[in-house]
């Protein structure tokens, strides 16, 4: 089955700059298929823009200004790129790549879409750190004791732009866990969002991760916020007078300032 | 030019109660095109649901049914047993791929129909209320209540800021909510909830424990590195060396 990955969740540009959006195709040989690009402007229908066929033929939608969009495909890297020249306010949109997934007969094809890249145009230079700043909340004792379950909460603040994806995984598992989230909220010039995960008691002793995708994450990779295992067996210890940290007691901090 | 027009902009549906979305074609006969349906969920993911000739996307065949009403020139998508996972924007789109004639392999989309999912009508359920804290941040977690109307109040004399609560459907088909705030006196913040003409307090759920039952480390600022000053905990939670975590990356 074909799979389309658009590594950039968003791309923030200042007016008149050039944006290049990438789409990586797997599960299908890009040399044997056409790649399509669509855009969804706020409040408008999703519109076909341009396609590039397996032989490199480019087809543009009528009414699209020439020289605005450039599309190409690189068979060696199985990628297609959409270049948007001289970006202006009317280019603000989410851009999707798509392809027809080959099935036995022509009429039985289906078109699959990539996750989209939102083009954001700003007139201000963002030199400050606008990556999502995380705060973790661990389950309250009351919840774990009374409900035999625990809720982890991942708060992300002071990020720009507003486009963000949050999901949860257990350590060493590729399964995305069912979580819940609030709306993205504007706070001054930046945004905040939170997501929470409730797990049964038997999963509390596993490490969980809140995985955050955002354009301005440090080094441009997903941020993985670790929620440590919660042990329900608690031992008493004789506090040491000095501030030594031994290997089993690393920075005694496990952020359990979660009261009832 | 052809146009695909959804019947409604927004369709509220109840969990488990079948719902029907309709999309009419203007300017052409629907029989000359293949109809497709897609769902866009939070985070912009566009997932293929159905294409004419009984083609369904993975995981959609059991719960969705696509159809064409040639006489009325419209496409129909039935959600047989909606669940909270079915919330999103639904789009109809058409093409003539493989039909002969003037061949178009691009999709022409209609505007989306926003499907909002509500729990089905059920007996009223009182919420459980728990407070979670980190530094000046306080979260009030309100679990498993019905109906939806609720007022969540974080009780503090030193409020810095508060955010609107998030209210969502729980996996069990009731509601969950979270309200966040920042307070100078976060240690003393409690949460009280007005629901169904009753008040529920987080303190109602507190577990009476002795002082060795939980670690209470020195408060750490929400996005700062752990405090360098030492404190002497009365107890230690077995954390399997997890405190190397980049708790605020």
């Amino acid at each position: 089955a074909g799979h389309l990955e658009q590594p950039q969740i968003s791309s923030t540009k200042t007016l008149s700059k050039t944006a290049r959006l990438e789409c990586v195709v797997s599960g299908i040989t890009i040399s044997a298929t056409s790649v399509y690009w669509y855009r969804e402007r706020p409040g408008e229908v999703i519109q076909f823009l341009v396609s590039i066929s397996y032989d490199g033929t480019v087809r543009k939608e009528s009414g699209i200004p020439s020289g605005k969009f450039e599309v190409d495909r690189i068979p060696e890297t199985s990628t297609s790129t959409l270049t948007i020249h001289n970006v202006e306010k009317q280019d603000i949109a989410t851009y999707y790549c798509a392809l027809w997934e080959a099935q036995q007969e022509l009429g039985k094809k289906i078109k699959v879409f990539g996750p989209g890249t939102k083009l954001i145009i700003t007139d201000k230079q963002l030199d400050a750190d606008v990556s999502p700043k995380p705060t973790i909340f661990l389950p309250s004792i009351a919840e774990t004791k009374l409900q035999k379950a625990g809720t982890y909460l991942c708060l992300l603040e002071k990020f720009f732009p507003d486009v963000i994806k949050i999901h949860w995984q257990e350590k060493k598992s590729n399964t995305i866990l069912g979580s819940q989230e609030g709306n993205t909220m504007k706070t001054n010039d930046t945004y905040m969002k939170f997501s929470w995960l409730t797990v049964p008691e038997k999963s509390l002793d596993k490490e969980h991760r809140c995985i955050v995708r955002h354009e301005n994450n440090k080094n441009g990779v997903d941020q993985e916020i670790i929620f440590p295992p919660i042990k329900t067996d608690v031992i008493t210890m004789d506090p040491k007078d000095n501030c030594s940290k031994d290997a089993n007691d690393t920075l005694l901090l496990q952020l359990t300032n979660t009261s009832a | 030019a052809i146009e695909l027009v959804p019947e409604h902009q927004t369709v509220p549906v109840s969990i488990g109660v079948p719902a029907t979305l309709r999309c009419s074609m203007k300017g052409e006969a629907i029989g000359n095109y293949y109809i497709n349906w897609y769902r866009k969920t939070q985070g912009n993911t566009m997932t293929f649901i159905y294409r004419e000739k009984d083609i369904y996307g993975p995981g959609f065949k059991d719960n969705f049914q696509g159809d064409i009403d040639i006489a009325k020139n419209l496409a129909v998508l039935k959600i047989l047993a909606p669940s909270e996972r079915d919330e999103g924007s639904y789009y109809c789109a058409c093409d003539t791929l493989g039909m002969g004639g003037e061949y178009t392999d691009k999709l022409i989309f209609g505007k989306g129909t926003r499907v909002t999912v509500e729990p089905r009508s059920q007996p009223h359920t009182k919420p459980s209320v728990f407070v979670m804290k980190n530094g000046t941040n306080v979260a009030c977690l309100v679990k498993e209540f019905y109906p939806k109307d609720i007022r969540i109040n974080l009780v503090s004399s030193k409020k810095i800021t508060e955010f609107d609560p998030a209210i969502v459907i729980s996996p069990s088909g009731k509601y969950n909510a979270v309200k966040l705030g920042k307070y100078e006196d976060s240690n003393s913040v409690t949460c009280s909830v007005q629901h169904d003409n009753k008040t529920v307090h987080s303190t109602d759920f507190e577990v009476k424990t002795d002082s060795t039952d939980h670690v209470k480390p020195k408060e750490t600022e929400n996005t700062k590195q752990p405090s360098k000053s030492c404190h002497k905990p009365k107890a230690i939670v077995h954390t399997e060396k997890v405190n190397m975590m980049s708790l605020t990356v």
């Epitope: 990955e5 700059k17 195709v25 797997s26 590729n174 | -």
Partner: antibody, heavy 118, light 107 residues
Framework: QGQMQQSGAELVKPGASVKLSCKTS????????ISWLKQKPGQSLEWIAW????????GYNQKFTGKAQLTVDTSSTTAYMQFSSLTTEDSAIYYC???????????WGQGTLVTVSA | DIQMTQSPASLSASVGETVTITCRAS??????LAWYQQKQGKSPQLLVY???TLADGVPSRFSGSGSGTQYSLKINSLQPEDFGNYYC?????????FGAGTKLELK
Amino acid sequence: QGQMQQSGAELVKPGASVKLSCKTSGFTFSSNYISWLKQKPGQSLEWIAWIHGGTGGIGYNQKFTGKAQLTVDTSSTTAYMQFSSLTTEDSAIYYCARRGYGAWFAYWGQGTLVTVSA
Amino acid sequence: DIQMTQSPASLSASVGETVTITCRASENIHNYLAWYQQKQGKSPQLLVYNAKTLADGVPSRFSGSGSGTQYSLKINSLQPEDFGNYYCQHFWSYPLTFGAGTKLELK
């Protein structure tokens, strides 16, 4: 933001093949691209290829197609690169690196020295 | 393929000095550029991406600038740990290519 541990140095004969490994930890392997790069002693860097940890999709520098073969083992979160028909020109340090949202290299393994000698 | 021409090939400087390394692309790469530092016997480390965004943990004495085909990396008030090799890399198109490098030595 995670570790990338590469296998040890290799001394191989011309014409032979070598399989290098890059064991990752501390980040979600299945949603990342692992790239391989070559650096001859005293020279600059060359990008060879990347592979997606989840889909197994591969992107090559055309110069290295047929020379490098990339695979992943998702259960051990390890990426592999097999280099075949080795010549002395292939003597180099080979790095694995984690790709950013744009195609820059955000985090690197420590490198594996491959020496091709008769 | 896009060629990246780095200059100078080598550079001698003293601690406390300010130095600038430049990189020219054979075509417009629209700020799709990264800089790396590599010390003897070590792996390269990301310094700057998107032409001017400082990577995590990189001191503020480093700064990237430029546009079109011309880019530069400036290091203010050189520190002893800054000596080593520096490479630029474009990611405008494939294949991804690097400059030949600049060797920054202690005078």
